[in-house]
C-alpha cells in the first residue's frame, strides 16, 4: 500500500476509533433523553427525567424564576432505576409504563449488535497490521459500515420511544428535548458509517488507468 | 380492556363529605395514574385530581383545600373524598385511567346530587 | 388557567353535511396539547382527537383535527346519524387541565 494510502487509512481509522469512543459512551450512559413536566405539579421543584437505554433516572430540580423545569445538570435529588425488563428483581415504579417496552428492549438490542460489529471491525484492523494482511480492511470496513447503520436505528427506536412517552396519556411527561448521550449516538453513527465507507475505498486495490490493464495487472498492494 | 366503575351515595348532605370509589378492572391498577374529574348538570367537564398508584397526587387548585384521592392497590380500587359540599358540587362524577393529558378510557359516571 | 370557548353553542346540520366546530383558548397552548371529546347523553366522553390533530384508535377518518396556538377546529367531514352528539375541547398544555362548555350538533 502507497504512503498516501497509509496515511489514509490511519486518518480513516483516527476517525473510527473516536466513532467507537462515542458509541461507547451512547451506549453506557443514559442522558439520551431528557422529559419534563407540567411546571405547575410543584411549587419549589420539579420532577424531570432522563433515560438511556438501560435506565431511567428522575431528579428533583430546583425550579428557577422563569418556571421551567431544569437544566437536568443543576444539583437535586436523583433516583435511578434499571428498567424491570433488564433486571426483573427491581421494581422501576413510576418508570415502567413510561418506557416502551419494546422499544426500550429494540434499541438495547440493536445497541448491542453495534457494538459487536466493532469488535468484529476492530479485530480485523488489529490482524491487518499483525502480518500485513491489507485486505482485512475491507470485512473491517463492512464491520464499522453496519455497526454505524445499527447505531442510527437505535437512534431511531429511542425517537420513537420518546414520541410514544410524550403523547401517551399515561405519563405525566409533556416537554422533552434529546441530551447529550443522543447526540454522542448520532456523532457515532456518521463517523462510523462514513470512515466505514471511506476504509472501504481505501482498502480497494487500485483500478487499472489503462484499457488494456486488468486488475491483475494493478500494482500489488505489497 | 381496562373497564372502570364508580359507585357511591347518590345523595348527600350539604356541609358533609362526598365520598366515591372507583373499582379497576381487565388491568391491574400498577403502574398507572388515575383521575377523577366531575361535570355539572348542563355544563362542562371539570379536572378534579390524579393519584398514582403509588399514592402520590395532584389536585385542581381550585379545590385542593377540599379534596382528597386515595389507592388502594389490594382491591385495585382509588377513592374520592370530598368534604364541606355545597349544591354547587351536584355533578356527574368520571373517574378515568392517566393524569394530565388526554383522558381515553372512563367510567360510566355517577350522579351525585347534594340536597338536604 | 386556560379558560376554552367553544363556538358555536349548537349546530344545526343535516346528515351527509360537513361540521366545523371551533375551540378558542384565553392563552397559548403548548406544543398544541388540546384534545377532542363526543359525548352521549348518559354515557362518559369518547376521546377523539388528542394532541390538536391526531386521531385516537378506531375513530373514523371523517373526524379531523386542526389548529395551533389558540384556535382550534374539529372538522367531520361528512355527518353520520351517530356524529349528532355534543362535543367538547380539552387542553392540556399547562394545570390545571380546563375543558370547553361544548358544541352540541344537531339535525337539522
Known amino acids: 500500500m502507497s504512503q498516501t494510502k497509509t496515511l489514509k487509512v490511519r486518518v480513516t481509522l483516527f476517525c473510527i476509533l473516536a466513532g467507537i469512543v462515542l458509541a461507547m459512551t451512547a451506549v453506557v450512559t443514559d442522558h439520551w433523553a431528557v422529559l419534563s413536566p407540567h411546571m405547575e405539579h410543584h411549587n419549589t421543584t420539579c420532577e424531570a427525567a432522563h433515560f438511556g437505554l438501560w435506565r431511567i433516572c428522575t431528579k428533583r430540580i430546583p425550579m428557577d424564576d422563569s418556571k421551567t423545569c431544569g437544566p437536568i445538570t443543576l444539583p437535586g435529588e436523583k433516583n435511578c432505576s434499571y428498567f424491570r425488563h433488564f433486571n426483573p428483581g427491581e421494581s422501576s415504579e413510576i418508570f415502567e409504563f413510561t418506557t416502551q417496552k419494546e422499544y426500550s428492549i429494540s434499541a438495547a438490542a440493536i445497541a448491542i449488535f453495534s457494538l459487536g460489529f466493532v469488535i468484529l471491525g476492530s479485530l480485523c484492523v488489529l490482524l491487518s497490521f499483525g502480518k500485513k494482511r491489507d485486505y482485512l480492511l475491507r470485512p473491517a470496513s463492512m464491520f464499522y459500515t453496519f455497526a454505524g447503520l445499527c447505531i442510527l436505528v437505535s437512534v431511531e427506536v429511542m425517537r420513537q420511544s420518546v414520541k410514544r412517552m410524550i403523547d401517551s396519556e399515561d405519563t405525566v411527561w409533556i416537554e422533552y428535548y434529546y441530551s447529550w448521550s443522543f447526540a454522542c449516538a448520532c456523532a457515532a453513527f456518521v463517523l462510523l458509517f462514513l470512515s466505514g465507507l471511506a476504509l472501504l475505498l481505501f482498502s480497494l486495490p487500485r483500478m487499472p488507468r489503462n484499457p488494456w490493464e486488468s486488475c491483475m495487472d494493478a500494482e500489488p498492494e505489497h | 380492556q381496562v373497564q372502570l366503575q364508580e359507585s357511591g351515595p347518590g345523595l348527600v348532605k350539604p356541609s358533609e363529605t362526598l365520598s366515591l370509589t372507583c373499582t379497576v378492572s381487565?388491568?391491574?391498577?400498577?403502574?398507572?395514574?388515575w383521575t377523577w374529574l366531575r361535570q355539572p348538570p348542563g355544563k362542562g367537564l371539570e379536572w378534579i385530581g390524579y393519584?398514582?398508584?403509588?399514592?402520590?397526587?395532584n389536585y385542581n387548585p381550585s379545590l385542593k383545600s377540599r379534596v382528597t384521592i386515595s389507592v388502594d392497590t389490594s382491591k385495585n380500587q382509588f377513592s374520592l373524598k370530598l368534604n364541606s359540599v355545597t349544591a354547587a358540587d351536584t355533578a356527574v362524577y368520571y373517574c378515568?385511567?392517566?393524569?394530565?393529558?388526554?383522558?381515553?378510557?372512563w367510567g360510566q359516571g355517577t350522579l351525585v346530587t347534594v340536597s338536604s | 388557567e386556560i379558560v376554552l370557548t367553544q363556538s358555536p353553542g349548537t349546530l344545526s346540520l343535516s346528515p351527509g353535511e360537513r361540521a366545523t366546530l371551533s375551540c378558542r383558548a384565553s392563552q397559548t397552548i403548548n406544543h398544541n396539547n388540546l384534545a377532542w371529546y363526543q359525548q352521549r347523553p348518559g354515557q362518559a366522553p369518547r376521546l377523539l382527537i388528542y394532541?390538536?390533530?391526531n386521531r385516537a384508535t378506531a375513530i373514523p377518518d371523517r373526524f379531523s383535527g386542526s389548529g395551533s396556538g389558540t384556535d382550534f377546529t374539529l372538522t367531520i367531514s361528512r355527518l353520520e346519524p351517530e356524529d349528532f352528539e355534543v362535543y367538547s375541547c380539552q387542553q392540556y398544555g399547562s394545570l390545571p387541565l380546563t375543558f370547553g362548555g361544548g358544541t352540541k350538533v344537531e339535525i337539522k
Open positions: 393519584i398514582y398508584y403509588s399514592g402520590s397526587a
Open positions: 381487565g388491568d391491574s391498577i400498577n403502574n398507572y395514574y
Open positions: 378515568a385511567r392517566g393524569a394530565v393529558k388526554y383522558f381515553r378510557h
Open positions: 394532541g390538536a390533530s
